[in-house]
């Protein structure tokens, strides 16, 4: 007789999910020499020990301090890009300028990266069928918990100016819902960074507003201010222009705005 | 089938550098992923790390003894070179070479012979 | 630097008997530890790694356990070719370090 299974409204764990996070792993340290340390295996374990038996609908932060632990990497607190409902253009952008980080440059974001997981309560397997939605079923799923977790760190590693890259072709340009909204901004450290720039892109070709005055950007002004953080705001009304002079600064057409 | 056989000096006087060299076998450090180490053992004593070079020459040295220690490779001569300079009596030890690789981290999976080095005037 | 106090420093059992060796890491390295058996004039041969994998080859007899600073390295039911010095390792954190090692004799 099957037994039965908690039939959640999420897509269940991503298929090959263990050696994905292992891969992943390997190559990671193999492309940043400053976390060959690492132990992959342990690091599997630590991942697969922060959700497995454990009730998708209870997981804590505490459940993956042995992985953070793990993943403990030291960026410059400077260079840091958070991003909000933008991730493919910040990624972009990171991959050219290679001296500014996302989430997902370090360890521990690269790792579940569009990845989906959770388990069972009192079993040790992976479920494979459904996982929690954040909205339908429960807020402390594994995958929300670990984005919470990373993403608190990350922006309570922040100092001086930290930019964030955020969509303008969205109906909330600011969202206090987002992860960025709703953990990062409220841990960024006032002791620490100087300035939160946010970087607006714009989506049409013919869109030349200054979407630095849309009422979202000037709640978030308004939060970031209260928390005695400077803000600016800087339209980028050609994103794929403003990549191509990411790569090529030198080029004439790039002292104009973008 | 990975095999690694140190070679040097079997006895060296005090003050003077020591070089040995780990060639090695069914191991390529123009391979990604893969790298080379040494660990000593002074008689009846633990063992210690001393260093580790991965492929594209990311270099780890043991902070106690950096300053005296050099590792180098020759990828096209399958060899793995390590230099210690100001050699003692206390450094009297077999030395081992040994490969590494990605994803392990620092877990020495196949071991040479080992070299027993004689520090003595 | 992490310190791996390994206990005991030497013992004796009989073939069949189950032995146990343990080693205490000085800061918590997670799960990053190797055990390595050395017979005399040989070079150690890796047993165990990341606390509780078996290496290739290892026979099931070995086994590896722990967390955090302790750990456990079990022979199940001893072999004479099991006489060996046994070492724990810690590969969390450069410098790698190892324990002072285990002698195990044959009663």
């Known amino acids: 007789v099957p037994r039965w299974r908690q039939q959640w409204s999420g897509p269940g764990t991503t298929k090959r999910f263990p050696e994905t996070v292992l891969a992943r792993c390997v190559k990671y340290t193999e492309i940043h020499p400053e976390m060959r340390h690492v132990d992959c295996q342990s690091v599997w374990d630590a991942f697969k020990g922060a959700f497995i038996s454990k009730h998708p609908c209870n997981i804590t932060e505490e459940d993956y301090q042995p992985l953070m632990k793990l993943g403990t990497q030291t960026v410059p607190c400077n260079k840091i890009l958070l991003w909000s409902r933008i991730k493919d253009l910040a990624h972009q952008f990171t991959q050219v300028q290679r001296d500014m980080f996302t989430l997902e440059d370090t360890l521990l974001g690269y790792l579940a990266d569009d990845l989906t997981w959770c388990g069972e309560f009192n079993t040790s397997k992976i479920n494979y069928q459904s996982c929690p939605d954040w909205r339908k079923d429960c807020s402390n799923n594994p995958v929300s918990v670990f984005w919470k977790t990373v993403s608190r760190r990350f922006a309570e590693a922040a100092c001086d100016v930290v930019h964030v890259m955020l969509n303008g072709s969205r109906s909330k340009i600011f969202d206090k819902n987002s992860t960025f909204g709703s953990v990062e901004v409220h841990n960024l450290q006032p002791e620490k960074v100087q300035t939160l720039e946010a970087w607006v892109i714009h989506g049409g070709r013919e869109d030349s507003r200054d979407l630095c005055q849309d009422p979202t950007i000037k709640e978030l002004e308004s939060i970031i201010s209260k928390r005695n953080i400077q803000f600016s705001c800087k339209n980028i009304y050609r994103p794929d222009k403003f990549l191509q002079c990411v790569k090529n600064p030198e080029d004439s057409s790039c002292t104009s705005e973008i | 089938q990975v095999t690694l056989k140190e070679s040097g000096p079997t006895l060296v006087k005090p003050t003077q550098t020591l070089t040995l060299t780990c060639t090695f076998s069914g191991l390529s450090l123009s391979t990604s992923g893969k790298g080379v180490g040494w660990i000593r053992q002074p008689p009846g004593k633990a063992l210690e790390w001393l260093a580790h070079?991965?492929?594209?020459?990311?270099?780890r040295y043991n902070p106690a003894l950096k300053s005296r220690l050099t590792i180098t490779k020759d990828t096209s001569k399958n060899q793995v070179v390590l230099t210690m300079t100001n050699m003692d009596p206390v450094d009297t030890a077999t030395y081992y070479c040994?490969?590494?690789?990605?994803?392990?981290?620092?877990?020495?999976?196949?071991w040479g012979q080992g070299t027993l080095v004689t520090v003595s005037s | 630097d992490i310190q791996m106090t390994q206990s005991p420093s030497s013992l004796s059992a009989s073939v069949g008997d189950r032995v146990t060796i343990t080693c205490q890491a000085s800061q918590d390295v997670i799960t990053s530890v190797a055990w390595y058996q050395q017979k005399p004039g040989k070079a150690p041969k890796l047993l165990i790694y990341s606390a509780s994998y078996r290496y290739t080859g290892v026979p099931s007899r070995f086994s590896g356990s722990g967390s955090g600073t302790d750990f456990t390295f079990t022979i199940s039911s001893l072999q004479p070719e099991d006489i060996a010095t046994y070492y724990c390792?810690?590969?969390?954190?450069?410098?790698?370090?190892f324990g002072q090692g285990t002698k195990l004799e044959i009663k």
């Open positions: 070079i991965w492929w594209d020459d990311d270099k």
């Open positions: 390792q810690q590969h969390y954190t450069i410098p790698l370090t």
């Open positions: 040994a490969r590494i690789e990605l994803g392990r981290s620092y877990v020495m999976d196949y």
